[in-house]
């Protein structure tokens, strides 16, 4: 009778084991072991027992002890089970961002590992087991579907293998994959709201605001604002689940025409975009042309108004005839026209909007000087010793210089408060002088003495 010890062995891949082959007869003709494994016999006293060191055991094997005794030949097998942890435990790659409400399939691949009967694959979210299955096939694959929720954001999913050799007196060997960190997001189906001027004048600045509600996580949202090829640099303010991106946009003559304003919101692997057209226009203020800005009284003056070729103008409220970009009027300058404003208003239609521009010029009329009864009375009668203020106003443009003299030397204090004395009595010659000429006027002052009262 042949026996083997141990009859069952579990050992690590590449390991060695001592196997003892024994026989019940004292003088066996033959005692040995049959195995493809490298073997080394350890010398022992006696003939009925042999010990072999079997090395580099790579896979399950069944070495067989045999003996040849007088009563016949017999054999005994030992069962060598090789164990090794899986070579690779991996979650199939997934996009890191997943939309809330979508089904996410987690797939774990396990390469190798033995004995497979003791190998289990576990899919986990954090420490919570999602699925547990025996490892079958090469590679062993375990899949599970997860409905992505908002509170899964930042959760780690992983795959663990458990080679449980505790029933064989060994330990539980665990291998864990690199974790997959899930980033969940919500990007609403509604496009972002874009508020901007529909028209924008060359060499001016406008403000563009792009906003969207119902985002998660809002801090991860990327906002791209652009006008044509010009990327805008917005200032973004965040709410709980909303953002507002505000940017200043400057346009030049090169941008003239219809431009596309875009606001794109990118979150995870999705985006929402809003497009709007902005018409960039050039519209200089109309030009008011006076033949001369300063004319003498009685001169003929032409006032012209010229604007953008597509504009319609009115000059001093009177529309151009025919309606168009030019208007003019003729007048003979009078003193009343001095300081008169000529206002030209131009209206241009841009993308359905009416844009108004105004320009005003003032006419200066040179006239005078003038001294008349209303402003410089020819006769004053004042009681002696009373307080009086002689008034004489000369008119003209430029304003004339005025002097009133008695006998060519004694001045009448115009505009000053004086005590009336006898010396004040007499006839004064008032002379108003300017670049436009001079006029004179006689003014008589009468003083009433108290004895006549």
């Amino acid at each position: 009778q042949t026996s083997v010890s141990p009859s069952k062995v579990i050992l690590p891949r590449g390991g060695s084991v001592l196997v003892t082959c024994s026989t019940s007869c004292d003088q066996p003709k033959l005692l040995g072991i049959e195995t493809p494994l490298p073997k080394k016999e350890l010398l022992l006293p006696g003939n009925n027992r042999k010990v072999y060191e079997l090395s580099n055991v790579q896979e399950d094997s069944q070495p067989m002890c045999y003996s040849n005794c007088p009563d016949g030949q017999s054999t005994a097998k030992t069962f060598l089970t090789v164990y090794w942890t899986p070579e690779r435990v991996e979650l199939a790659p997934l996009p890191s961002w997943q939309p809330v409400g979508k089904n996410l399939t987690l797939r774990c691949q396990v390469e190798g590992g033995a004995p497979r009967a003791n190998l289990t694959v576990v899919l986990l979210r954090g420490e919570k087991e999602l699925k547990r299955e025996p490892a079958v096939g090469e590679p062993a694959e375990v899949t599970t579907t997860v409905l992505v929720r908002r509170d899964h954001h930042g959760a780690n999913f992983s795959c663990r293998t458990e080679l449980d050799l505790r029933p064989q007196g060994l330990e539980l060997f665990e291998n864990t994959s690199a974790p997959y960190q899930l980033q969940t997001f919500v990007l609403p189906a509604t496009p972002p709201q874009l508020v901007s001027p529909r028209v924008l004048e060359v060499d001016t600045q406008g403000t563009v605001v792009c906003s969207l509600d119902g985002l998660f996580p809002v801090s991860e949202a990327q906002v791209h604002l652009a006008l044509g090829d010009q990327r805008l640099n917005p200032t973004v303010t965040y709410g709980n689940d909303s953002f507002s991106a505000k940017a200043s946009v400057s346009v030049t003559a090169e941008d003239e025409g219809t431009q596309r304003l875009t606001c794109a919101v990118i979150l995870g692997n999705q985006s929402q975009e809003t497009l709007q057209t902005v018409t960039i226009y050039s519209f200089p203020a109309p030009n008011v042309i006076l033949t001369k800005p300063e004319v003498s009284e009685g001169t003929e003056v032409t006032v012209k108004c010229e604007a953008h070729p597509r504009a319609k103008v009115t000059l001093n409220g009177v529309p151009a005839q025919p309606l168009g970009p030019r208007a003019q009027l003729l007048l003979k300058a009078t003193p009343e026209d001095n300081g008169r404003s000529f206002s030209c208003s131009a209206t241009l239609e841009v993308a359905g909007q009416l844009i108004h521009k105004n320009q005003t010029r003032e006419l200066r009329v040179l006239y005078g000087p003038r001294l008349d009864e209303r402003d410089c009375p020819g006769n004053w009668t004042w009681p002696e010793n009373s307080q009086q203020t002689p008034m004489c106003q000369a008119w003209g443009n430029p304003l004339p210089e005025l002097k009133c003299l008695k006998d060519g030397t004694f001045p009448l204090p115009i505009g000053e408060s004086v005590t009336v004395t006898r010396d004040l009595e007499g006839t004064y010659l008032c002379r108003a002088r300017s670049t436009q000429g001079e006029v004179t006027r006689k003014v008589t002052v009468n003083v009433l003495s108290p004895r006549y009262e």
């Epitope: 070579e87 690779r88 390469e111 190798g112 497979r116 096939g137 090469e138 694959e141 690199a178």
Partner: antibody, heavy 120, light 112 residues
Framework: QVQLVQSGAEVKKPGASVKISCKGS????????LHWVRQAPGQRLEWMGV????????DYNQKFRGRATITVDTSASTAYMELSSLRSEDTAVYYC?????????????WGQGTALTVSS | DVVLTQSPLSLPVTLGQPASISCRSS???????????LHWYQQRPGQSPRLLIY???NRFSGVPDRFSGSGSGTDFTLKISRVEAEDVGVYFC?????????FGGGTKLEIK
């Protein structure tokens, strides 16, 4: 003992297709993946692709994707590699080799090889 | 693709003498799990390749202990402590760390 036995030598014309078989025995066929490797004259060994004999999943070297197709018939414990649109550069010895799916423990047993000659 | 460069191309050795073959990789062969999937094969004349060493230094079943492998990262070596007549053939290194898997150009071992 583990054995991988491949089909015999083939001579094909350019533009034709060839299908080589590889039958596994002496082990549980679905416990291992099968890889295909070729050796052209004067060239280094070239990995072509792999099949999971359990699930039928495949992975290919980009160089052969679209031209090579690896399939399996588990009931016959046989894997197949079909190469289409043959050209003279495909003249080589084609081997199947047993391994783990990602080859992490090396290709431990190889078939005897199938010689393919592509010539007009 | 990862390029494996073997040297020397040809290796004449006297029987009983040691032999050493080098394999250098164009990038590290350490996988993200810390393992290095670099293997060595022997191809005797007229035969299929045969696995000698897997994962840098593990001898496969039935491979004599005169064969040993070492190295890390990008530099690896196959050593034969005492060359025997049956060792004649071409030796290849191979990597299964990066996709697609690649082989070295081979080193031809011959007896002087």
């Amino acid at each position: 003992q583990v054995q991988l036995v491949q089909s015999g030598a083939e001579v094909k014309k350019p533009g034709a297709s060839v299908k080589i078989s590889c039958k596994g025995s002496g082990y549980t066929f679905t416990d291992y993946a099968l890889h295909w490797v070729r050796q052209a004259p004067g060239q280094r060994l070239e990995w072509m692709g792999v099949i999971s004999t359990y699930s039928g999943n495949t992975d290919y070297n980009q160089k052969f994707r679209g031209r090579a197709t690896i399939t399996v018939d588990t009931s016959a414990s046989t894997a197949y590699m079909e190469l289409s649109s043959l050209r003279s550069e495909d003249t080589a010895v084609y081997y199947c080799a047993r391994s783990l799916y990602f080859g992490s423990s090396g290709f431990d047993y190889w078939g005897q090889g199938t010689a393919l000659t592509v010539s007009s | 693709d990862v390029v494996l460069t073997q040297s020397p191309l040809s290796l004449p050795v006297t029987l009983g003498q040691p032999a050493s073959i080098s394999c250098r990789s164009s990038q590290t062969l350490v996988y993200r799990n810390g393992n290095t999937y670099l293997h060595w094969y022997q191809q005797r004349p007229g035969q299929s390749p045969r696995l000698l060493i897997y994962k840098v230094s593990n001898r496969f079943s039935g491979v004599p202990d005169r064969f040993s492998g070492s190295g890390s990262g990008t530099d690896f070596t196959l050593k034969i402590s005492r060359v025997e007549a049956e060792d004649v053939g071409v030796y290849f290194c191979s990597q299964n760390t990066h996709f697609p898997y690649t082989f070295g150009g081979g080193t031809k071992l011959e007896i002087k």
